[in-house]
């Protein structure tokens, strides 16, 4: 008799794929544009990335460091009107893209939460949650919560408001902290909170260190749903050299949880390559005319247009990974098992019941390595086959779809492999 199928877990929309942050509308749209009406015109691009949610803003009225002139219910007229916002919501809904609104109050000021009048600000946030929930927003983000006194209790209250409206609504909190204990203390009183942090931001050194960080986090958070990013707002290129971007894309899309990216991560947008551009929000490179300040500074392969035409580009890799992440059960909600593969490597399996299984092997080092996959580390339910099919490599040159012998697996410097193999009873 065939074994019984494992019962599927309840899946919220943010469990099904990546979130895409647009913190600065002007930088994202460029060319002196930067309003909600213009963003509506970019929704097809977001659809092509197969992201599930757009984390937008902040876009509310905020006079720098002035609580009285900060109104979380009013859209800054520079960004548009409530009608523009409503139109964006409706269009996003038609494309199955959820909209998450950033309500970080003093986003133009020194302290995101103002240094005084905590209760006043917290009341403003409560009002805003209720108002925007009723206006059709799918969730909220608040950043820099390390600057918010009694953050845990406020987050619990805001979570109650958000979930009280509908279980299908999401609250994201962001912190600059990379300390696991601080992160856990924020999480423990807030079930279902999605927390973005700088926890992985110093993981670029070795495969062992990354493996240690990831497994510690997953062990500490237990059955909680996680999010994966390198920071609460910044670009991947703020933390990683270009040669590791593909590796991290592969990792973020295949770890158990919600991957969270900032606009430009999909093309390797790098402020350092654009003189005069702010590190936290460089202009998005749609094409070579997006950065006219210095003629010739932008080549086609740095842009959305150029990378869209190149199947070997970072953007093409992002789209493929995003597609796999949103449709494969083992990547959607499968179990995770990390195991030893040799120094410099980080490897893990994702599997769900009798569905197709995935093996990820990541070489963080700058030398080629043979992988010594230690299958003995794995439970019986996640055993390795002798061969697995190559779904994709982060480096060009490998023949996709070809079976690879796992005992003889060799990885190029900074290469990541995503392999698939069937369930075997």
């Amino acid at each position: 008799r065939a074994p019984r199928c494992r019962e599927l877990p309840a899946q919220k929309w943010w469990h099904t794929g990546a979130l895409y942050r647009i913190g600065d509308l002007q930088a994202f749209q460029g060319h002196g544009a930067g309003n909600l009406a213009g963003l509506k015109g970019r929704l097809d691009y977001l659809s092509s990335l197969k992201v599930k949610g757009l984390v937008l803003g902040p876009i509310h009225k905020n006079q720098k460091d002035d609580v009285a002139q900060t109104d979380l219910l009013q859209i800054d007229p520079n960004f548009g009107s409530k009608e523009d916002f409503d139109s964006l919501l409706q269009s996003a809904k038609k494309k199955s893209i959820r909209v998450i609104l950033d309500l970080t109050p003093n986003y133009r000021g020194e302290n995101s939460w103002f240094s005084t009048q905590v209760d006043t600000v917290a009341t403003k946030v409560k009002d805003a949650l209720e108002f925007w929930l009723q206006a059709g927003v799918d969730g909220f983000q608040v950043r820099d919560i390390e600057n918010l006194k009694d953050a845990s209790s406020f987050l619990a209250e805001w979570q109650n408001i958000t979930k009280g409206f509908s279980e299908d609504r999401l609250l994201i909190a962001g912190t600059n902290s990379s300390d696991l204990q601080q992160i856990l203390s924020l999480l423990e009183s807030n079930k279902d909170l999605l927390l973005t942090s700088s926890y992985l931001s110093d993981s670029g050194s070795t495969g062992e260190h990354t493996k240690s960080l990831v497994t510690q986090y997953l062990n500490a958070t237990g059955n909680r749903w996680c999010s994966w990013s390198l920071s609460q707002a910044r670009l991947l290129t703020s933390f990683l050299p270009a040669q590791l971007l593909r590796l991290y894309q592969l990792m973020l899309f295949t770890l158990p949880g919600t991957p969270v990216f900032s606009y430009g991560d999909e093309i390797g947008l790098d402020a350092a390559a654009l003189p005069g551009q702010p590190m936290e929000a460089p202009v998005m490179l749609w094409d070579e005319s997006s950065f006219p300040d210095i003629p010739g500074a932008v080549s086609a392969n740095m842009t959305v247009k150029g990378q869209s035409e190149d199947p070997g580009s970072l953007l093409s890799l992002f789209r493929r990974l995003s597609d796999q992440r949103s449709k494969e059960r083992s990547l959607l909600h499968g179990d995770f098992h990390a195991f030893s593969a040799g120094p410099g490597l980080f490897s893990y399996i994702r599997h769900w019941d009798q569905n197709e299984r995935f093996l990820v092997v990541l070489n963080f080092g700058d030398v080629g390595l043979s992988a010594g996959l230690q299958a003995s580390d794995l439970p019986a339910s996640a055993s390795l086959p002798a061969k697995a099919d190559l779904l994709l490599s982060t480096q060009p040159g490998r023949e996709e779809g070809s079976p690879l012998e796992l005992e003889r697996l060799k990885l190029e410097p900074h290469e990541g492999l995503l392999l698939r193999f069937p369930y075997a009873a």
Epitope: A68, D71, L72, L73, Q74, K82, D86, D119, T120, T123, K124, V125, K126, D127, A128, E130, F131, L133, Q134, A135, G136, D138, I161, G164, F165, S166, D168, R169
Partner: antibody
């Protein structure tokens, strides 16, 4: 118990500013918002605006250029100012509590105060 | 702005009989986010402020007699008084409290005893 009481001059001259106060008791101003509504004699209800617990305000766009709503938490009072009034602004003016989370329904109302605009 | 239209403008019903008031909105008042319908009913007796009867189209405010019930979804709504009492003589208003302001009222329906 929850109470709201409107007060202000019953007669205002055309082109002047109508000023009303709503004094509340029995609930916390940091937990509930307050609506202003008006009703011309023998007619229906018109929503003017809502001031939230945190001080944010939603206005009826038809009146927005003339209306100002504010709060003085130390006195448990809300105020409504309507400038450049005409005879069409003659009405009973009510304040009412926004009573429920995820709803703009008004669960407690003041008795209302009649304001007549006439020279 | 959402326009609310009530019918009839006035209604005369015998004591103990059913009274039905209709309200139509110019757009749907269903919030797909929480599947609630944002329609409120008020009762206003002569010389008094309005009184909240029903919110979310069908949720009775505490203390409101159960002879008052609200129904409907989308754009068409009904307030029913199952057995009219003398104290129910009043003007009844529906109000949209959906999404963005202004939160507009219907023109009112006057209920009298036949």
């Amino acid at each position: 118990q929850v109470q709201l009481q409107e007060s202000g001059p019953g007669l205002v001259k055309p082109s002047e500013t109508l000023s009303l106060t709503c004094t509340v008791s029995g609930f916390s101003l940091t937990s509930y918002g307050v609506h202003w509504i008006r009703q011309p004699p023998g007619k229906g209800l018109e929503w003017i605006g809502l001031i939230w617990a945190g001080g944010s305000i939603n206005y009826n766009s038809a009146l927005m250029s003339r209306v100002t709503i504010s709060v003085d938490t130390s006195k448990n009072q809300f105020s409504l100012k309507l400038s450049s009034v005409t005879a069409a602004d003659t009405a009973v003016y009510y304040c009412a509590r926004k009573g429920h989370m995820y709803s703009y329904a008004m669960d407690y109302w003041g008795q209302g105060t009649l304001v007549t605009v006439s020279s | 702005d959402i326009v609310m239209t009530q019918s009839p403008d006035s209604l005369a019903v015998s004591l103990g009989e059913r009274a039905t008031i209709n309200c139509k909105s110019s757009q749907s008042l269903l919030n797909s986010g929480n599947q609630k319908t944002y329609l409120t009913w008020y009762q206003q007796k002569p010389g008094q402020p309005p009184k909240l009867l029903i919110y979310w189209a069908s949720t009775r405010e505490s203390g409101v007699p159960d002879r008052f019930s609200g129904s409907g979804s989308g754009t068409d709504f009904t307030l029913t008084i199952s057995s009219l009492q003398a104290e129910d003589v009043a003007v009844y208003y529906c109000q949209n409290d959906y999404s963005y302001p202004p939160w507009t009222f219907g023109q009112g329906t006057k209920v009298e005893i036949k």
